[in-house]
Amino acid sequence: AIVFIKQPSSQDALQGRRALLRCEVEAPGPVHVYWLLDGAPVQDTERRFAQGSSLSFAAVDRLQDSGTFQCVARDDVTGEEARSANASFNIKWIEAGPVVLKHPASEAEIQPQTQVTLRCHIDGHPRPTYQWFRDGTPLSDGQSNHTVSSKERNLTLRPAGPEHSGLYSCCAHSAFGQACSSQNFTLSIADESFARVVLAPQDVVVARYEEAMFHCQFSAQPPPSLQWLFEDETPITNRSRPPHLRRATVFANGSLLLTQVRPRNAGIYRCIGQGQRGPPIILEATLHLAEIEDMPLFEPRVFTAGSEERVTCLPPKGLPEPSVWWEHAGVRLPTHGRVYQKGHELVLANIAESDAGVYTCHAANLAGQRRQDVNITVATVPSWLKKPQDSQLEEGKPGYLDCLTQATPKPTVVWYRNQMLISEDSRFEVFKNGTLRINSVEVYDGTWYRCMSSTPAGSIEAQARVQVLEKLKFTPPPQPQQCMEFDKEATVPCSATGREKPTIKWERADGSSLPEWVTDNAGTLHFARVTRDDAGNYTCIASNGPQGQIRAHVQLTVAVFITFKVEPERTTVYQGHTALLQCEAQGDPKPLIQWKGKDRILDPTKLGPRMHIFQNGSLVIHDVAPEDSGRYTCIAGNSCNIKHTEAPLYVVDKPVPEESEGPGSPPPYKMIQT
């Protein structure tokens, strides 16, 4: 037989706390134990579950755990079943709730001198005791026209008056604990002698010199007083108006009228209502003066046909916010269609050339109206007026290539030469009409040129070949004055080019023929051995059939080229002594000598007292100093040639003679001693 060693017993439990219903059985064979609640099997949950044979509660729940529990033991082999005694919980709990109006049925029905009943919806077991509070202060029974019915959890105010106004709350406590109202009730019973707002003034925006009206009404018994004040606390009455409110009128119903409003009237107006009792009620409203500023300028817009574009109109700053609309040709744009207004945007869908023109954005408010135009251009692809042509341009003269196109807006033209963009410089210029000017045509300008004409809608291009008509010219022009070395072989070249290869010949300027030792070989004048008589004026003549002839005059000088008779030597001088650098040159014409010291030419007129250049070319430096050290160059030149030679000058300290050295001992290096 199945025997219960421990049976569950009824017990007190606290809401939300742990509990255990014990059950232990003894049986000859294996049994399984389960629990019933009000006759229905109990399913294990995280909150309520079997713990061995006992039933454990992690948190007692007054709703789910109310009822009769029974422990059942069953032998599944024999089918024998035993049931324990019934057990239940006496669950102690308390739960917060709101303070609600029980009587009258609605807040709107609360009047002075009526009975008002409030109910505290805090529940619990055992039944809690209640405490009421107004504005946080406890209320005791029978005090100040109110009764507390603890049994009914009610607070009755009999009769209710203004002195009962406030925030009502309740708290309750029992053996389980304490709870306070989750939502409180504000009782507002107007004192008829207190001022109450009937009509509050609103902010107003008016145009300059227009009128503004503020409405303000209070009610009370007896009737309340009403006063208007402007910003600086100046009272406004029909008898005493401040200087800046001369045109103010206060009506019997409390409204304030301001006529011919000026900027100084803008600001805050206060309407103050005062009842026989209670605090004053202050209502504020602001008078704004309407204003509207200028609109920002639009940049002209260029659109392409077929596209969809938008132009945003930014309303000007203003009060109130200005409304915005678009017009075209004096007609307000619709809100739908192909060209329409959406909000403050002008929308052009599938743009056509005919949409081009001036569109006007208007903005307006109480202060006035502003407008701003935007010029819309519908771009077209350029078309040809004159394409560039293959051209023959004369060398040395200006050359022109046309690229004349038309489009809206005016197309931009760029030129390419051999696929390279031509940037305008001293030789190339692109005119406003697209024509390219080459200021002085050169032979290498003969190539391909391409012009491209563009607008935002697209571009066109064409190319042309330039052939340069070469002029008859010397290449290079012979030097007009040349020298030949006496008694030596000499050549004077002359070459030319032209549209046809020119023939070149030399002749003496006086027309006389060339001596037999002088030959003219394809433009090169050759002197086998130069004589004095070969000096003089010669002319090189280049000619061809189509271009005629050109002449170049050359004056030939026969000279004995420069040689140095005496060259300066490496020289070392004691500081304070005199240095002599010798230099003598010969040649025909007689050469002139110049000196260069330390990388600058020594100007004989600016040498100063220490330096001097002799007639024969020698350079003398007196009282030498260390800074005179350096390389000195002797330059000899005449009209035919120039030669130079150089030597270093060293300036050293004079050594102090040693005892062993005799007075006649030679210095350790070559010196000039003076």
Partner: antibody, heavy 116, light 107 residues
Framework: QVQLQQSGPELVKPGASVKISCKAS????????MNWVKQRPGKGLEWIGR????????NYNGKFTGKATLTADKSSSTVYMQLSSLTSEDSAVYFC?????????WGQGTTLTVSS | DIQMTQTPSSLSASLGDRVTINCRAS??????LNWYQQKPDGTVKLLIY???ILHSGVPSRFTGSGSGTDYSLTISTLEQEDIGTYFC?????????FGGGTKLEIK
């Protein structure tokens, strides 16, 4: 006084959708465009799209086509943005904004967190 | 889409300094260029619209300039309250686009 009041923060799971709102007050609602802007944490601003409150016409940034859907309720002066097929990349602050020259107003932003 | 390139991406300056932020668009904007300031708390405020018009209530130390594709925002004398991130935004061609932002810090 112009105000744009946006709905509160949202925490949603990847793959789900969310609808955030922006209530306008204090200006003529029906003749304005309302814009939506996205800002990922520590990043810049991205324009999502806009809706014309008069007729519900919309323009979207191509990047957000299919992701965002803008609608408006004229009677309550409220605009909505629905974001669908949410991923972690959609976690951001979303602003509604009315741009009109000097009359420029932004909502306070709605934080969307997409997390499993 | 129009690309907006904002430089520098961050800068640190001393109080009283003159600060300039640049914005370059990939195509002309016809002056439809706005500058916004975003405070560290996330609030966004318009400073300049239509390239150079100062938004109501914005201090006059902020100025905007530029045309075509190149625009700039200058703060003539930097103040502590100017810290934040600055964005340029074009309103010429849909979709509207923003610059990457310039974070301004005080040295």
């Amino acid at each position: 006084q112009v105000q744009l009041q946006q709905s509160g923060p949202e925490l949603v799971k990847p793959g789900a959708s969310v609808k955030i709102s922006c209530k306008a007050s204090g200006y003529p609602f029906s003749t304005s465009w309302m814009n939506w802007v996205k800002q990922r944490p520590g990043k810049g601003l991205e324009w999502i799209g806009r809706i014309y409150l008069g007729d519900g016409d919309t323009n979207y940034n191509g990047k957000f086509t299919g992701k965002a859907t803008l609608t408006a309720d004229k009677s309550s002066s409220t605009v909505y943005m629905q974001l669908s097929s949410l991923t972690s990349e959609d976690s951001a602050v979303y602003f509604c904004a009315r741009w009109r020259g000097d009359y420029d107003y932004w909502g306070q932003g709605t934080t969307l967190t997409v997390s499993s | 889409d129009i690309q907006m390139t904002q430089t520098p991406s961050s800068l640190s300056a001393s109080l009283g300094d003159r600060v300039t932020i640049n914005c370059r668009a990939s195509q002309g904007l016809s002056n439809y260029l706005n500058w916004y300031q975003q405070k560290p708390d996330g609030t966004v405020k318009l400073l300049i619209y239509y390239a150079s018009i100062l938004h109501s209530g914005v201090p006059s130390r902020f100025t905007g300039s530029g045309s075509g594709t190149d625009y700039s925002l200058t703060i003539s004398t930097l103040e502590q309250e100017d810290i934040g991130t600055y964005f340029c935004q074009q309103g010429n061609t849909l979709p509207w686009t923003f610059g990457g932002g310039t974070k301004l810090e005080i040295k």
